[in-house]
Interface confidence: medium
């Protein structure tokens, strides 16, 4: 019979013959012959292959380097790579999460609208009228101005987006 020019799914062509690919989690040891099946071996402890393949070497699991702020989100298997994420307080610099940076701080006059996650940075917002922030923080929201009235005091100094109001005693000398 004519040697095949194409093979079925999960097969590959070698030496004019169709051999079975190795399943995910296994690597190729030797191609099939007329008389023998493809020989495959499981990947080692810290290795993986995630497709039907004819690779002679498995891929190393990704290393989540703690010096780059990374930690393991999902441990790799023989068929899947390790997934890294950032430690709390840090977020990934890229979709591949190869390293982490510290969450951005919001400057005085701005508060945190949304605390950063492992994949997105802090979202800051200007403190609106009636609110202030006098800190540089990646976590603190804008705080409302103190209500002098509820303390039976009066406003002695108006608040800004960076400072609270200053309350003082009522002026007793009222005409």
């Amino acid at each position: 019979p004519e040697p095949p020019t194409a093979c079925r799914e999960k097969q590959y062509l070698i030496n004019s013959q169709c051999c079975s690919l190795c399943q995910p989690g296994q690597k190729l040891v030797s191609d099939c012959t007329e008389f023998t099946e493809t020989e495959c071996l499981p990947c080692g402890e810290s290795e993986f292959l995630d497709t039907w393949n004819r690779e002679t070497h498995c891929h190393q699991h990704k290393y989540c380097d703690p010096n780059l702020g990374l930690r393991v989100q999902q441990k790799g298997t023989s068929e899947t790579d390790t997934i890294c994420t950032c430690e709390e307080g840090w977020h990934c610099t890229s979709e591949a999460c190869e390293s982490c940076v510290l969450h951005r701080s919001c400057s005085p006059g701005f508060g945190v609208k949304q605390i950063a996650t492992g994949v997105s940075d802090t979202i800051c917002e200007p403190c609106p009228v009636g609110f202030f922030s006098n800190v540089s923080s990646a976590f603190e929201k804008c705080h409302p101005w103190t209500s002098c009235e509820t303390k039976d005091l009066v406003v002695q100094q108006a608040g800004t987006n960076k400072t609270d109001v200053v309350c003082g005693p009522q002026d007793r000398l009222r005409a």
Partner: nanobody
């Protein structure tokens, strides 16, 4: 000039406790998030904990969660790290750092001299 002075380190047995302090001066302490980082012998820097300016929010690296507690007293310009159930792997020089506006890891803008914690029997 910004100054951070850590203290409270020492030799402690596994399972023991220590309380580290960091006295801050030269900047408005209450106006900044702060953090603890550590460096074990022959290792890179490792972030340990962050505390927000008001002390409301705290974050910890996985290996110390439930064992370490970070707090601050803004009236005393002091940052604390309460370390319980200490393990040999906690042995390191501990530094407090001011959380700057933006930096990459391992590039902290203000440093103290650190305080050495040794956990050994």
């Amino acid at each position: 000039e910004v100054q951070l002075l850590e203290s409270g380190g020492g030799l402690v047995q596994p399972g023991g406790s220590l309380r580290l302090s960091c006295a801050a001066s030269g900047f408005t302490f209450s106006g900044y998030d702060m953090q603890w980082v550590r460096q074990a012998p022959g290792r890179g820097l490792e972030w340990v904990s962050t505390i927000s300016a008001s002390g409301v929010y705290t974050y910890y690296t996985d290996s110390v969660k439930g064992r370490f507690t970070t707090s601050r007293d803004n009236s005393k310009n002091t940052l604390y790290l309460q370390m319980n159930s200490l393990r040999a792997e906690d042995t390191a020089v501990y530094y407090c750092t001011k959380y700057p506006n933006r930096f990459a890891r391992n590039n902290f803008d203000y440093w103290g001299q650190g305080t050495l914690v040794t956990v050994s029997s």
